[in-house]
């Protein structure tokens, strides 16, 4: 049964209706709507816009529009009892105190509910001590330390810059080093943009402004006390001592003014080079402890947080496919904010907002997709993508039998200079067409395609005329579909210019100042960057769920595979004699990849060919390249890492939002000359380069003839 | 439809105790705590405190601390206060609302339709 | 604990008139105040939450404002289902603490 034979429409006209539908005025709306006040995850606030997304959900036409809540670890700061930094004299007197709140912006001075700033998760505490300056607190950064410079970390606060790298990365790492604290801040020369105004005249960082955020090191394993199984009312919870990824030192988050206080103060060794100078007036001096003058000052940090279980709710809307219900494309995004969320998530939240609406009205006429969509209002991503993790443990054993594909929809934008797209190679063919099929909104791209605009501004590095499409990582909402389940997956947005923008992430991220404002009059006054995004994410939705042949291209995993084993060939290259010495061989690795992109190129042709009148031959083709990305998954999961299953892809080990290739050969290699047993170093890289090799293999023979 | 259903009128003698209850029904009774609020004859209204049956968390007034404790039965969707050392003052209705069990919330939405406890030698 | 001092304690007023009763707050309290309505045999009813929003159900007559410590709700046109006795209550901090009441009566 084709698909035509669930409405009297023509799949492209389908296609066409939907797009159509989709309207800037109404992402505008949704967004305003949203965005008034906080939605911080566990709070009445957020139940409520929960359901009232459940009853806007049921009013556009889905089928059914469901809460599912989960009890899961949260952190909030002790609301009579606030967390701040302060600089103490010989005496132990408060001589300096950090902000404990951000200035409100303008119009939001009466808003009750705005969280102070704090880092998610910290345990509570009040050290007190010299001050190290750790730059971004990256992997490189405590080895230039600790190796080059001779600096000891231990027994010390740290302060690092945010950007680079995932907080909570920086947080282990500071915790390694033997740090008995850390004070996070926001650097003008990382989110403070040159030539731009400061909030409410511009989009930059004002001094007062602080990011939140959580400081976990979950690897995917959801709720801290609950890790592989749902939060359900009868879940069994670890005690605090057994949770996952939790720090054990106190950390907290500043703005640039009170950093700037902090760091004019420190004396010790000069910054290594210019790479650890940020923008303010200060040395950059690395410590540890302040300058002569200063010397018997110290730092003292005041952290009161706490740890509460507590009741989440995603919204999690269905429209049944008329031809395979019991195939699933999901589409995601969290609902939860940190304070008004104008772009994280609300700018993606609206997005999905109106491509529901424009689903519910075709369904309103009559039309069905082939494949069940599932709609999902995430909660407590902030809080370590906890919602769509407890979902998907609750939901597993449904999902790796019939998820067909993830697609992720938090911020719509972070910049609005061009696409950004990350996902799955088997998504490659399918982002090309159809962006090939929409307009451009960029300037000077009229009557363009976006594909046009996006390959000119942001070129793939390997192919000419291409658009670059980057590995997934993780951060969002996608991790748990991804690399704990292997379902196929992507996300979409509109970004910045890299080149001439080097600061991290936007300036605004996961402050107070994240408002509506914000987007309508420094981002996106049309609205037509989150229209272009809303077709980019509907249209891909759209076309997983609805075409005949699911529109996945294998050949281009074939290339990827290449390219990924050429890569950690040559790393592992980098120590020809141990290679050597420890008869180390990455045959086995080529020649699956060889055999794989013959397999996938064979699978291709039989696709080009296959009778599709034929229901079960269809089904059959249409399995196998849904499966294919399962294929990928070993059950035993990482080293260490058990929730991360992805044998071709995972999150960096030294930065949680960066994807790896081949991880495990990666973090195998990784500082191999530095241990102590090469021997039983080398064997570790030996057995990874063998995982690797049998799961590319086995994946290619999913693809084979199956008879 | 969210309601909160109390048990009837009482009389105590000073120095008894009393048990009011409070039947929840209409939404999912461990998403949302209960609070306790008097109201003595002619008088405005006291907040004595709140239980959240989610966590087993009271959180009582100074004022009642010691003489008041709250309990709830989450197989059967009721929470209990118990006030004791009852003096003629406590006369009163004692009303039972329902509060969001979250670190914001927006206090008391719905509210039972109260208790009247009369102490009298 | 925060105090709340409302006025006036008592009103008459008609069919029609507008009506504003205010609450202040002896400490900031932000928007976490609700207005509550209890009819004469008792029944209690939320009319406003965190200042200014409107309960389900609640006809539009009524409306909720800030201005600085000060709370006011504002009945546009009373009608008669409207002869009660009002309250503010804080909920910034424990013990929550409630206005002494304005009691609406028929002029």
């Known amino acids: 049964k084709s698909s035509n034979e669930a409405t009297n429409i023509t799949p492209k006209h389908n296609m066409k209706a939907f797009l159509d539908e989709l309207k800037a005025e109404n992402i505008k709306k949704f967004l305003y709507n949203f965005t008034q006040i906080p939605h911080l995850a566990g709070t009445e606030q957020n139940f409520q816009l929960a359901k009232q997304i459940q009853s806007q959900w049921k009013e556009f036409g889905l089928d059914s529009v469901e809460l599912a809540h989960y009890d899961v670890l949260l952190s909030y700061p002790n609301k009579t009892h606030p967390n701040y930094i302060s600089i103490i004299n010989e005496d132990g007197n408060e001589i300096f105190n950090t902000s404990l709140f951000e200035p409100p912006p303008p119009g939001y001075e009466n808003v009750s509910d705005i969280v102070p700033p704090f880092s998610a998760f910290s345990p509570q505490g009040m050290p007190e001590g010299d001050l190290v300056y750790v730059n971004y607190a990256r992997t490189e950064d405590f080895f230039k330390l600790e190796r080059d410079m001779k600096i000891n970390c231990s027994g010390k606060i740290v302060i690092a810059r945010y950007g680079k790298v995932f907080r909570g990365n920086k947080v282990k790492n500071a915790q390694l080093a033997g740090a008995k604290g850390v004070i996070l801040y926001s650097d003008p020369a990382d989110y403070f943009a040159p030539g731009v105004k400061s909030y409410p005249d511009g989009w930059n960082l004002p001094g007062g402004g602080v990011q939140r955020g959580n400081i976990l090191n979950l690897n995917g394993a959801g709720d801290p006390l609950t890790p592989g199984y749902p939060a359900n009312e009868y879940a069994y919870r670890r005690g605090i001592a057994e949770a996952v990824g939790l720090p054990s030192i106190p950390v907290h988050p500043i703005g640039y003014y009170d950093a700037q206080k902090l760091l004019e103060k420190m004396g010790g060794s000069a910054p290594p080079d210019s790479s650890w100078r940020g923008s303010l007036k200060v040395p950059y001096n690395v410590g540890p402890g302040f300058t002569g003058n200063f010397s018997t000052q110290k730092v003292k940090m005041h952290i009161h947080s706490t740890n509460e279980v507590t009741r989440i709710y995603n919204v999690i809307g269905t429209l049944r496919g008329a031809v395979e219900p019991d195939r699933y494309v999901i589409l995601g995004g969290h609902r939860d904010s940190w304070v008004f969320g104008g772009i994280d998530p609300q700018s993606g939240a609206a997005v999905v907002h109106e491509i529901v609406r424009s689903f519910g009205t075709l369904k309103k006429e009559g039309w069905r997709p082939r494949r069940t969509i599932l709609f999902a209002s995430w909660d407590a991503e902030e809080f370590g993508l906890l919602g769509s993790t407890e979902w998907a443990e609750e939901n597993s054993r449904l999902l790796q039998e019939r998820g067909v594909a993830y697609i992720n929809a938090d911020s719509s934008i972070e910049g609005n200079y061009t696409l950004r797209v990350d996902c799955t190679p088997l998504m490659y063919s399918l982002v090309h067409n159809l962006t090939k099929e929409l307009k451009s909104p960029d300037e000077g791209f009229e009557g363009k395609s976006l594909y046009e605009s996006w390959t000119k501004k942001s070129p793939s590095p390997e192919f000419s005329g291409m658009p670059r499409i980057s590995k997934l990582g993780s951060g969002n909402d996608f991790e748990v579909f991804f690399q704990r389940l292997g379902i196929a997956s992507g996300r979409a947005r509109y970004t910045k210019n890299w080149e001439t923008n080097k600061f991290s992430g936007y300036p605004l991220y996961h402050s107070v100042y994240e408002t509506y404002e914000l987007v309508e009059k420094f981002y996106d006054p049309m609205f037509k960057y989150h229209l272009t995004v809303a077709q980019v994410r509907g249209g891909m939705v759209f076309e997983l769920a609805n075409s005949i042949v699911l529109p996945f291209d294998c050949r281009d995993y074939a290339v990827v595979l290449r390219k990924y084993a050429d890569k950690i060939y040559s790393i592992s290259m980098k120590h020809p004699q141990e290679m050597k010495t420890y008869s180390v061989s990455f045959d086995s690795l080529f020649s699956a990849v060889k055999n794989f992109t013959e397999i996938a190129s064979k699978f291709s042709e039989r696709l080009q060919d296959f009778d599709k009148s034929n229901p079960i031959v269809l089904r059959m083709m249409n399995d196998q390249l849904m499966f294919l990305e399962r294929a990928f998954i070993d059950p035993l999961g990482l080293p260490d890492r058990p929730f991360y299953r992805h044998v071709i892809y995972a999150p960096s080990s030294h930065n949680k939002y960066a994807g790896e290739s081949f991880p495990g050969i990666y973090d195998a290699l990784f500082d191999i000359e530095s241990k102590v047993d090469p021997s039983k170093a080398w064997g570790e890289v030996k057995r990874q380069i063998y995982v690797a090799a049998f799961t590319v293999q086995a994946a290619a023979e999913t693809l084979s003839e199956v008879a | 439809e969210v309601q909160l259903v109390q048990s009837g009128a009482e009389v105590k003698k000073p120095g008894a105790s009393v048990k009011v209850s409070c039947k929840a029904s209409g939404y999912t009774f461990t998403s949302y705590g209960i609070s306790w609020v008097r109201q003595a004859p002619g008088q405005g209204l006291e907040w004595m405190g709140e239980?959240?049956?989610?966590?087993?968390?009271?959180y009582y007034n100074e004022k009642f601390r010691g003489r008041v404790t709250m309990t709830t039965d989450k197989s059967t969707s009721t929470a209990y206060m118990e006030l004791r050392s009852l003096r003629s003052d406590d006369t009163a209705v004692y009303y039972c609302?329902?509060?969001?069990?979250?670190?914001?919330?927006?206090?008391?939405?719905?509210w039972g339709q109260g208790t009247t406890v009369t102490v009298s030698s | 604990d925060i105090q709340m001092t409302q006025s006036p304690s008592s009103l008459s007023a008609s069919v029609g008139d507008r009506v504003t009763i205010t609450c202040r707050a002896s400490q900031d309290i932000g928007s976490s105040l609700n207005w509550l309505q209890q009819k004469p045999g008792g029944a209690i009813k939320r009319l406003i939450y965190?200042?200014?929003s409107l309960d389900s159900g609640v006809p539009s007559r009524f409306s909720g404002s800030r201005s600085g410590s000060d709370y006011t709700l504002t009945i546009s046109s009373l009608q008669p289902e409207d002869f009660a006795t009002y309250y503010c209550?804080?909920?910034?901090?424990?013990?929550?603490?409630f206005g002494g009441g304005t009691k609406v009566e028929i002029k």
């Open positions: 209550l804080q909920y910034a901090s424990s013990p929550y603490t």
């Open positions: 965190a200042t200014s």
């Open positions: 609302a329902r509060v969001f069990d979250g670190y914001y919330n927006y206090a008391m939405d719905y």
């Open positions: 239980i959240f049956p989610r966590r087993g968390n009271t």
